[in-house]
Interface confidence: low
């Protein structure tokens, strides 16, 4: 059997505060526990949620939590169900509200000698006690023609007279707390001798030089006086008008007429009514001069056929607010249909090509009229004038692929090569008509090309294959001057390509035949052992049937490659002494020596007085300084060969000899001493 160890109990709770309805269950098997409120299951929210078997309230709500809660435990296996005792909250709360008129139904019905009932909309539980105030002064029950009904939160004035006029407020307090009215009620009961408004002047907007009329009437017993003032407090009467209001007329019924209004007449006009008693009533109205500004420009618009589009016309600033309408071909657009005006918008539904043209937005008010045109283009899908064709383009020459289309607006053409977008550079150029120019066709330009022509309405595309007609050429061209090492094996390659595979042969420039130790093997000239006589001019000839022949001239030099006889050594020198770096090379042609120090070539013509390069190639540096330290490279080169070797130079301070050392003591390391 399911047993409740703890049952929920009815309890006091405070609005907006925490609360907990406890429920603990013991049962032989697993049970699931849920809660009911007025018989309906309670859903978990952030505010009210199950906490174990209990129901937790993060903030009690007087409306949502009013009712009877019950804890239900159910064994889903056996179907057994047990319900706890009912529990409810006695929720304590107080909430501010306005002071409202309960009787009569509207302020307009309040007359002297009628009963007036005000209600204090501060509510709470337990029911609060109420205190009423007029103009901040507390009212006690039963004094001066009023009764306070605390239970109904009402203040009744019977009968109400001018002496009851004032600002009514209320406060209430209970065990929960206290609150005062969030909005107060001003009771105004007129004294017959006080001036009352019958007709109040309204703001007017007039065009320059037109007339303006302000109406103003008061009533009282005896009849009140009425006076008009302009901004600077100058009275306006038919006898004494201010200089800038010469054309003003005050009528017997209180109305003020201004004719031929000028900018200086714009401003605030005050109508003042004064009864025999009571304060003057001042009513204000403003005279505005009509004005209208210019309209902003429209950007041209491009729309697609079949779509629905809107163009908004921003009305110009103006007073009064300008009215706006759209025209097309001189005819005002209707407010319904396929092409129509909605508010300030031009609406084109299911756009047709015939809708293209100039539409005009007009704006007008008392001050005048403004207009602005918008050019609407209806986009069409491009159509072909000339598609790209499969083409044979000659290598090295410019090639052209056409993509000629027409549409409204002018279509945009892009080209793709092997599905990759072609961006314009020095080799590719897209002309305004869509034609692609390949400035100097190369072999690898032989592939698929696709052009796409687009407008906002859609696009078309076509592709073409380019075949490159290869020119007869050496690949790569042989170096015009080459060296061979004396007494060694040497090869001189020559290869070429063309539309047909060319045949390649070598010959001496003087026409003589190649000696027997020199062979021409498929374009490679092979010297088994180079002799002095092998030097000279040779020609490589490549030829095929359709393209003829091409020639490349090569001058071969026989040389003894460079070797170093003397190489510079690692050298350490005292500061202020002289350093000598030796270098001597041999070869044929006789090599020249150059030095590089600290990563720059030492130009013999620009060396200072401290440095000198000897005929034999040695480098001498006088009066060495620490900044001369570093790596020095000897470079030997001739027309056939270049070689280099390097050594470091260290510049050190000369040690000061200690007294124990004799004058002939050796230095601590190997030195060049000068």
């Amino acid at each position: 059997a399911i047993v409740f160890i703890k049952q929920p109990s009815s309890q006091d709770a405070l609005q907006g505060r925490r609360a907990l309805l406890r429920c603990e269950v013991e049962a032989p098997g697993p049970v699931h526990v849920y809660w009911l409120l007025d018989g309906a299951p309670v859903q978990d929210t952030e505010r009210r949620f199950a906490q174990g078997s209990s129901l937790s309230f993060a903030a009690v709500d007087r409306l949502q939590d009013s009712g009877t809660f019950q804890c239900v435990a159910r064994d889903d296996v056996t179907g057994e169900e047990a319900r706890s005792a009912n529990a409810s909250f006695n929720i304590k709360w107080i909430e501010a509200g306005p002071v409202v008129l309960k009787h009569p139904a509207s302020e307009a019905e309040i007359q002297p000698q009628t009963q007036v009932t005000l209600r204090c909309h501060i509510d709470g539980h337990p029911r609060p006690t109420y205190q009423w105030f007029r103009d901040g002064t507390p009212l006690s029950d039963g004094q001066s023609n009023h009764t306070v009904s605390s239970k109904e939160r009402n203040l009744t004035l019977r009968p109400a007279g001018p002496e009851h006029s004032g600002l009514y407020s209320c406060c209430a307090h209970s065990a929960f707390g206290q609150a005062c009215s969030s909005q107060n009620f001003t009771l105004s009961i007129a004294d017959e001798s006080f001036a009352r408004v019958v007709l109040a002047p309204q703001d007017v907007v007039v065009a320059r030089y037109e007339e303006a009329m302000f109406h103003c009437q008061f009533s009282a017993q005896p009849p009140p006086s009425l006076q008009w003032l302009f901004e600077d407090e100058t009275p306006i009467t038919n006898r004494s008008r201010p200089p800038h209001l010469r054309r003003a007329t005050v009528f017997a019924n209180g109305s003020l007429l201004l004719t031929q209004v000028r900018p200086r007449n714009a401003g605030i006009y005050r109508c003042i009514g004064q009864g025999q008693r009571g304060p003057p009533i001042i009513l204000e109205a403003t005279l505005h001069l009509a004005e209208i500004e210019d309209m902003p420009l429209f950007e041209p618009r491009v729309f697609t056929a079949g779509s629905e589009e809107r163009v908004t016309c921003l009305p110009p600033k103006g007073l009064p607010e300008p009215s706006v309408w759209w025209e097309h071909a001189g005819v005002r657009l209707p407010t319904h249909g396929r092409v129509y005006q909605k508010g300030h918008e031009l609406v084109l539904a299911n756009i047709a090509e015939s809708d293209a043209g100039v539409y005009t937005c007009h704006a007008a008010n008392l001050a005048g009229q403004r207009r602005q045109d918008v050019n609407i283009t209806v986009a069409t899908v491009p159509s072909w004038l000339k598609k790209p064709q499969d083409s044979q383009l000659e290598e090295g020459k410019p090639g052209y692929l056409d993509c000629l289309t027409q549409a409204t607006p002018k279509p945009t053409v892009v080209w793709y090569r092997n599905q990759m977008l072609i961006s314009e550079d020095s080799r590719f150029e897209v002309f305004k008509n869509g034609t692609l120019r390949i400035n100097s066709v190369e072999v690898y330009d032989g592939t698929w090309y696709r052009c796409m022509s687009s407008t906002p309405a859609g696009s078309i595309e076509a592709q073409a294959r380019v075949q490159v007609l290869e020119k007869l050429k050496f690949t790569p061209p042989p170096q015009p001057q080459q060296c061979m090492e004396f007494d060694k094996e040497a090869t001189v390659p020559c290869s070429a390509t063309g539309r047909e595979k060319p045949t390649i042969k070598w010959e001496r420039a003087d026409g003589s035949s190649l000696p027997e130790w020199v062979t021409d093997n498929a374009g490679t000239l092979h010297f088994a052992r180079v002799t002095r006589d092998d030097a000279g001019n040779y020609t490589c000839i490549a030829s095929n049937g359709p393209q003829g022949q091409i020639r490349a001239h090569v001058q071969l030099t026989v040389a003894v490659f460079i070797t170093f006889k003397v190489e510079p050594e690692r050298t350490t020198v005292y500061q202020g002494h002289t350093a000598l770096l030796q270098c001597e090379a041999q070869g044929d042609p006789k090599p020249l020596i150059q030095w590089k120090g600290k990563d720059r070539i030492l130009d013999p013509t620009k060396l200072g007085p401290r440095m000198h390069i000897f005929q034999n190639g040695s480098l001498v540096i006088h009066d060495v300084a620490p900044e001369d330290s570093g790596r020095y490279t000897c470079i030997a080169g001739n027309s056939c060969n270049i070689k280099h070797t390097e050594a470091p130079l260290y510049v050190v301070d000369k040690p000061v000899p200690e007294e124990s050392e004799g004058p002939g003591s050796p230095p601590p390391y190997k030195m060049i001493q000068t």
């Epitope: 007025d38 007087r62 409306l63 009013s66 009712g67 009877t68 009912n86 509200g97 306005p98 409202v100 008129l101 309960k102 009787h103 009569p104 139904a105 509207s106 209600r119 909309h121 509510d123 539980h125 029911r127 239970k151 109904e152």
Partner: antibody, heavy 119, light 113 residues
Framework: EVQLVESGGGLVQPGGSLRLSCTAS????????VIWVRQAPGKGLEWVGI???????YYANWAKGRFTISRDTSKNTVYLQMNSLRAEDTAVYFC?????????????WGQGTLVTVSS | EIVMTQSPSTLSASVGDRVIITCQAS????????LAWYQQKPGKAPKLLIY???KLASGVPSRFSGSGSGAEFTLTISSLQPDDFATYYC?????????????FGQGTKLTVL
């Protein structure tokens, strides 16, 4: 479970009278304003009258003078006394309770009782 | 006399549709938010959906929502479900000054398209 149960409906002749009762279980009806609402066959809801916690009553303009609402706190019951009944008073009459003692909006409805005025 | 006008009076829609019902009072409510919405099915008592103009009653699905203040109010069903086809009423509290403490809209009948 909180419930409102109306009773006392039935057939009555034009000009006759009827008293409907609204009894609550699970709540103390004296803590709430109680509202009577009616619904003519196939028509919308129409407010009849209200009794506040402090026994003040208000009625729809058409019901003034013919219908009276009262309560018996000891029996947890509110009554609607209907006099000078007419054919157009034929409807299902619902009693309902407000959200709280200060809000007249209806939170809970009874199931309704049918009143038929016919000769 | 206070009049509460619901629009539309009848409305046909499909499951999954978003539905909006409006309620306009001929004068402002007692406190600007004193308005409730109810759902009624044939032969049954009305069921509370929304109170104080925008608060969801306990156990009511979150697809129902309310908004508005003063004299104009809206009930929105964000995605109509088969169980939602019924008649909906707005209900407002007024000052009792002209004898009208409470009033109901004429109802909006929501049917399957």
């Amino acid at each position: 479970e909180v419930q409102l149960v109306e009773s006392g409906g039935g057939l009555v002749q034009p000009g006759g009278s009827l008293r409907l009762s609204c009894t609550a279980s699970g709540i103390d009806l004296s803590n709430y304003a109680v509202i009577w609402v009616r619904q003519a066959p196939g028509k919308g809801l129409e407010w009849v009258g209200i009794i506040y916690t402090y026994d003040t009553t208000y009625y729809a303009n058409w019901a003034k003078g013919r219908f009276t609402i009262s309560r018996d706190t000891s029996k947890n019951t509110v009554y609607l006394q209907m006099n000078s009944l007419r054919a157009e008073d034929t409807a299902v009459y619902f009693c309902a309770r407000s959200f709280s003692d200060i809000s007249d909006l209806i939170k809970l409805w009874g199931q309704g009782t049918l009143v038929t005025v016919s000769s | 006399e206070i009049v509460m006008t619901q629009s539309p009076s009848t409305l046909s829609a499909s499951v999954g549709d978003r539905v909006i019902i409006t309620c306009q009072a001929s004068q402002s409510l007692y406190n600007n938010k004193d308005l409730a919405w109810y759902q009624q099915k044939p032969g049954k008592a009305p069921k509370l959906l929304i109170y104080e103009a925008s608060k969801l009653a306990s156990g009511v699905p979150s697809r129902f929502s309310g908004s508005g203040s003063g004299a104009e109010f809206t009930l929105t069903i964000s995605s109509l479900q088969p169980d939602d086809f019924a008649t909906y009423y707005c209900h407002g509290e007024f000052s009792c000054g002209s004898g009208d403490c409470l009033a109901f809209g004429q109802g909006t009948k929501l049917t399957v398209l």
